[in-house]
């Protein structure tokens, strides 16, 4: 069959999902493209337990997640309901801050150095985390 039964090389298994943690940065859209080309998606955080797991692996580094409000309301990339789901924003965030001088507000969410979330300019080259569920699709490719 085509179902994935174990995580590929360099991915980490946790609670029936596979996670891949980048060590370099890309803009949110390009990180999203990377994950999709790998038959995955930017990480969707659905619980405090998953938050702690991801936070442990990324350390104190700004890191994109699969949450954005580029089309208005906040949305998770996999369709998980935002309003009723887990949230871990920093105090007074998200604030759609326009004062950065880069044009527009802040439409993409990332983990900050303490793990809590902030909205930021989507073009910033942050690290990112991909996630894919086991038993969903074919195995990911090995590395070059």
């Amino acid at each position: 069959g085509s179902e994935r039964t174990c995580c590929p090389v360099n991915w980490v298994e946790h609670e029936r999902s596979c996670y891949w943690f980048s060590r370099s940065g890309k803009a949110w859209a390009d990180a999203d493209n990377y994950c999709r080309l790998e038959d995955a998606h930017l990480v969707v955080v659905t619980s405090w337990e998953e938050q702690k797991f991801v936070q442990h692996h990324i350390g104190p580094v700004n890191t994109w997640m699969g949450l954005h409000d580029q089309n208005g309301p906040w949305k998770w990339v996999d369709g998980t309901d935002y309003e009723t789901g887990f949230k871990n924003w920093r105090p007074e965030q998200p604030d759609d801050w326009y004062g950065h001088g880069l044009g527009g507000g802040e439409d993409c969410a990332h983990f900050t150095d303490d793990g809590r979330w902030n909205d930021d300019v989507c073009q910033r080259p942050y690290r990112w985390v991909c996630e894919t569920e086991l038993d969903k699709a074919s195995q990911e490719p090995p590395l070059l």
Epitope: S24, L37, D39, P125, E140, P141, L143, L144
Partner: antibody, heavy 122, light 107 residues
Framework: EVQLLESGGGLVQPGGSLRLSCAAS????????MSWVRQAPGKGLEWVSA????????FYADSVKGRFTISRDNSKNTLYLQMNSLRAEDTAVYYC???????????????WGRGTLVTVSS | EIVLTQSPATLSLSPGERATLSCRAS??????LAWYQQKPGQAPRLLIY???KRATGIPARFSGSGSGTDFTLTISSLEPEDFAVYYC?????????FGGGTKVEIK
């Protein structure tokens, strides 16, 4: 032997259609994203389209968006490019290429076919 | 989209000489840069990825360096089979883009 073999090229009139195929062998095809890259006669390389291993995600260059469709049949180890509304500027050698993934999060073309020539002319 | 500018367009050298090829990006691509070699009538071949890592089977005389916007491919001592066209390619931003190429020809 690890290889990619393109077919389906030929002469087609402007506005016409063509379907390219790429037969893969020697590696686990459905594990890898794949891509098409083209090269106009005497010119440089241009990325055209890419597809994830399962086929669930597809990507296109602006120059072909809405006209070309990339797909794959993993049971046949074959990649396809359906080209519609062809224009003279689509004339090129079309290469099928396997996308390798690096630790840093890059995608590069680590295996190429020999290419198939598509000529769009009346 | 990111524009990659390669220079020089043509490099005329003799076997045994050192070749230095440049690739400049219109904005930072971090280290998401690859180099390919293409000989007449053949498909391209991956030489270098992530700016400085040699692909499988590539001889040590090929090396890549740089990050951000400025990158270099160096061939330490040209062999007869190295005379070809070389392309750089970035995977920092969608769409993937290639440079216009540098032809290394026999002087």
């Amino acid at each position: 032997e690890v290889q990619l073999l393109e077919s389906g090229g030929g002469l087609v009139q402007p506005g016409g259609s063509l379907r390219l195929s790429c037969a893969a062998s020697g590696f686990t095809f459905n594990n890898y994203p794949m891509s098409w890259v083209r090269q106009a006669p005497g010119k440089g390389l241009e990325w055209v389209s890419a597809i994830s291993g399962s086929g669930s995600a597809t990507f296109y260059a602006d120059s072909v968006k809405g006209r070309f469709t990339i797909s794959r049949d993993n049971s046949k180890n074959t990649l396809y490019l359906q080209m519609n509304s062809l224009r003279a500027e689509d004339t090129a050698v079309y290469y099928c290429a396997k996308l390798g993934t690096t630790v840093s999060g890059g995608h590069y073309f680590d295996l190429w076919g020999r290419g198939t020539l598509v000529t769009v002319s009346s | 989209e990111i524009v990659l500018t390669q220079s020089p367009a043509t490099l005329s050298l003799s076997p045994g000489e050192r070749a230095t090829l440049s690739c400049r990006a219109s904005q930072s691509v971090s280290s998401y840069l690859a180099w390919y070699q293409q000989k007449p009538g053949q498909a391209p071949r991956l030489l270098i990825y992530d700016a400085s890592k040699r692909a499988t089977g590539i001889p040590a005389r090929f090396s890549g360096s740089g990050s951000g916007t400025d990158f270099t491919l160096t061939i330490s001592s040209l062999e007869p089979e190295d005379f070809a066209v070389y392309y750089c390619q970035q995977d920092s931003n969608h769409p993937l883009t290639f440079g216009g190429g540098t032809k290394v020809e026999i002087k």
